[in-house]
């Protein structure tokens, strides 16, 4: 899997997890956002080569086309599969909420 | 959506469905399909500026990191939502076999 | 019911100035990213300018050092200032509102034309 356990431990070009910490104020200008500051959103990049963690029927023939016809614009990309929830803290007026935010942590990725 | 009753008819730099015809023997090198001789693939590409067509929260999330931090490499990619199967008849040996194939035509695009 | 009403656009000649003003109801406004698209004959919407709930900003390349973006959150509005304007701003200007708690929303749209 192209996880924090693979893609952390390995320099890798090709389509991995890469590392995101997001701070809520500084990086997005939300200041809404009582609890946390910020949170490891984490991002998919990378090369998407032949037979790379492909995702589908589709990307495994995208992959083939794509290396057998290298000056095609078509092409698989590194997208993210798994995604964790985030809880948050902030206010309505002086009333405090607390409400998860569904997908937003990627744990891993794929070729799509 | 981003299909081809809207990719097909606008000029789109953004993330959209792009006509793609495979034939399977030319493009792939494969010899062993007998029908069809190639098929309309399709496949997802274009920029992901911020709020076009987001997938989940954390493509929302990053599609604003990057419209404030241009700079930086984190941005979402423009991949396939909605696939269809392709049905094929190919032989081993002399018998001949009729397969369902998943997942091998796109039919719309999200980034993600 | 969330509204966004744009106003402010019109007919200008070029190098002139508009300023455009969303006005929102129905939503926490101060927690709402606000942008403002806009959207020419043929051509695809495209992102003119943001500022987000904390004021952070950001503008199209086209615009830059012309075009500025604020809001006042006791007014629940947005605003777009266009100075130096250029035929290729002609195009109708949409206001969009969005929090990532809840889908976007986006207003009827100001029509802008720049013409001598």
């Known amino acids: 899997a192209l996880d924090a356990a693979y893609c952390f431990r390995n320099v890798q070009d090709n389509c991995c997890l890469r590392p995101l910490y997001i701070d809520f104020k500084r990086d997005l200008g939300w200041k809404w956002i009582h609890e946390p500051k910020g949170y490891n959103a984490n991002f998919c990049a990378g090369a998407c080569p032949y037979l790379w963690s492909s995702d589908t029927q589709h990307s495994r023939v995208l992959s083939l086309y794509n290396t057998i016809n290298p000056e095609a614009s078509a092409s698989p990309c590194c997208v993210s599969q798994d995604l964790e929830p985030l809880t948050i803290l902030y206010y309505i007026g002086k009333t405090p909420k607390i409400e998860q935010l569904s997908n937003m942590i990627v744990k891993s990725c794929k070729c799509s | 959506a981003l299909d081809a009753a809207y990719c097909f008819r606008n000029v789109q730099d953004n993330c959209c469905l792009r006509p793609l015809y495979i034939d399977f023997k030319r493009d792939l090198g494969w010899k062993w399909i007998h029908e069809p001789k190639g098929y309309n693939a399709n496949f997802c590409a274009g920029a992901c500026p911020y709020l076009w067509s987001s997938d989940t929260q954390h493509s929302r999330v990053l599609s604003l990191y990057n419209t404030i931090n241009p700079e930086a490499s984190a941005s979402p990619c423009c991949v396939s939502q909605d696939l269809e199967p392709l049905t094929i008849l190919y032989y081993i040996g002399k018998t001949p076999k009729i397969e369902q194939l998943s997942n091998m035509i796109v039919k719309s695009c999200k980034c993600s | 019911q969330v509204q966004l009403v744009e106003s402010g656009g019109g007919l200008v000649q070029p190098g002139g100035s508009l300023r455009l003003s969303c006005a929102a109801s129905?939503?926490?406004?101060?927690?709402?990213?606000m942008a403002w698209f806009r959207q020419a004959p043929e051509k695809q919407r495209e992102l003119v300018a943001l500022i987000t709930s904390g004021g952070k900003t950001a503008y199209a390349d086209s615009v830059k050092g012309r075009f500025a973006i604020s809001r006042d959150n006791a007014k629940n509005t947005v605003y777009l200032q266009m100075n130096s304007l250029k035929a290729g701003d002609t195009a109708v200007y949409y206001c969009?509102?969005?929090?990532?708690?809840?889908?976007?929303?986006w207003g009827q749209g100001t029509q802008v034309t720049v013409s001598s």
């Open positions: 129905g939503i926490t406004f101060s927690h709402y990213d």
């Open positions: 969009n509102a969005h929090w990532v708690l809840t889908s976007q929303y």
